[in-house]
């Protein structure tokens, strides 16, 4: 789902207040609900009728450093006999998410939000079009 | 997918540098790749064999203020005839994501990262268990 543009008032101080110096804000250390965990059904990526594989991307200057991307294995979907049914389509489910980018020059460290597009998994759909028109 | 714990060195300055004052960091204004957009297939939530509905949650002190959560519609999956197949299971696909929480007292505004669990959509799986065990 979409993250709206940030050019609005979210990161601004109220108009009656002095502006933020140097175009930066105060980010408190620590993460709220840090212990909250995804605990999905077991092995859904291989048991799905639209199975997918995971690829891990790693960047030490990003938080989280590890971002996992899914790739659908098939164009069609897997039927009850374990065969590919090309009358159906496997499609990726995507999500916009925020990560934090670390920028440092010597002892001066700053952070910036970055929007990342993550493919979370795949689902099997009935096609809208059966061929390119 | 999981976001690791933040109690490591990501938000710390190098050991040879003076510590961050007051337990806060500098967050630059603006978002990298802000214009990046999800461009999923049309109406996959209703065309999926494991269809879902969306519910929008709104919080003016969170960025993004709007977080969309998916809810699977069925326990089973929808077959080619549009009937529910109870030999298969619809399951939610979840993702841990970061949002920014705004905290203000008068003109003093600070921000903190928050982890949120988002159900992004649903997929159809062959059951491991046919009912709750």
């Amino acid at each position: 789902r979409k993250i709206p543009k940030v050019g609005h008032t979210f990161f601004q101080k109220p108009e009656s207040c002095p502006p933020v110096p140097g175009g930066s804000m105060k980010l408190d250390i620590g993460i709220i609900n840090e212990n909250q965990r995804v605990s999905m059904s077991r092995n859904i990526e291989s048991r799905s009728t639209s199975p997918w594989n995971y690829t891990v991307t790693w960047d030490p200057n990003r938080y989280p450093s590890e971002v996992v991307q899914a790739q659908c294995r098939n164009l069609g979907c897997i039927n009850a006999q374990g065969k590919e049914d090309i009358s159906m389509n496997s499609v990726p489910i995507q999500q916009e998410t925020l990560v934090v980018r670390r920028k440092h020059q010597g002892c001066s460290v700053s952070f910036q939000l970055e929007k990342v597009l993550v493919t979370v998994g795949c689902t099997c759909v009935t096609p809208v079009i059966h061929h390119v028109q | 997918r999981k976001i690791p714990k933040v109690g490591h060195t990501f938000f710390q300055k190098p050991e040879s540098c003076p510590p961050v004052p007051g337990g806060s960091m500098k967050l630059d204004i603006g978002i990298i790749n802000e214009n990046q957009r999800v461009s999923m297939s049309r109406n996959i939530e209703s065309r999926s064999t494991s269809p879902w509905n969306y519910t929008v949650t709104w919080d003016p002190n969170r960025y993004p203020s709007e977080v969309v959560q998916a809810q699977c519609r069925n326990l089973g999956c929808i077959n080619a005839q549009g009937k529910e197949d109870i030999s298969m299971n619809s399951v939610p696909i979840q993702q841990e994501t970061l949002v920014v929480r705004r905290k203000h007292q008068g003109c003093s505004v600070s921000f903190q990262l928050e982890k949120v669990l988002v159900t992004v959509g649903c997929t159809c799986v062959t059951p491991v268990i046919h009912h709750v065990q």
Partner: nanobody, 123 residues
């Protein structure tokens, strides 16, 4: 944290009927399905019925099929279990709970349960 309050349990004669209710609060927005479970003395807790909040479709354990009906009221965040043709073997404490993974939910996925409601069927 999900709060669950079950009610409606009673002592009833074999062949009789009861309607159990479950009030739910603190559910995640994405909560998907609800279930009824029961635990007879000296036995494991077992699945009885399930319903999806959105689609309203239901599933039943073989032992209650055709006799029990599960329904829900989304506005009130309540689920119900209509129990007909009750048998002595239906005697148990009945519990409701969120089913975060629908029919894939396992008993060890649960952190907490309500206090349950006692159903006793006499012969």
């Amino acid at each position: 944290q999900v709060q669950l309050v079950e009610s409606g349990g009673d002592l009833v004669q074999a062949g009789g009927s009861l309607r159990l209710s479950c009030s739910v609060s603190g559910l995640r927005v994405s909560s998907y399905a609800m279930g009824w479970f029961r635990q007879a003395p000296g036995k494991e807790r077992e699945f009885v019925a399930a319903i999806s909040w959105v689609g309203g479709d239901t599933r039943y354990a073989d032992s209650v099929k055709g006799r029990f009906t599960m329904s829900r009221d989304n506005a009130k965040k309540q689920v119900y279990l209509e129990m007909n043709s009750l048998k002595p073997e239906d005697t148990a404490v009945y519990y409701c709970n969120d089913m975060p993974y629908g029919m894939e939910t396992r008993m060890d996925d649960y952190a907490s349960w309500g206090q349950g409601t006692q159903v006793t069927v006499s012969s």
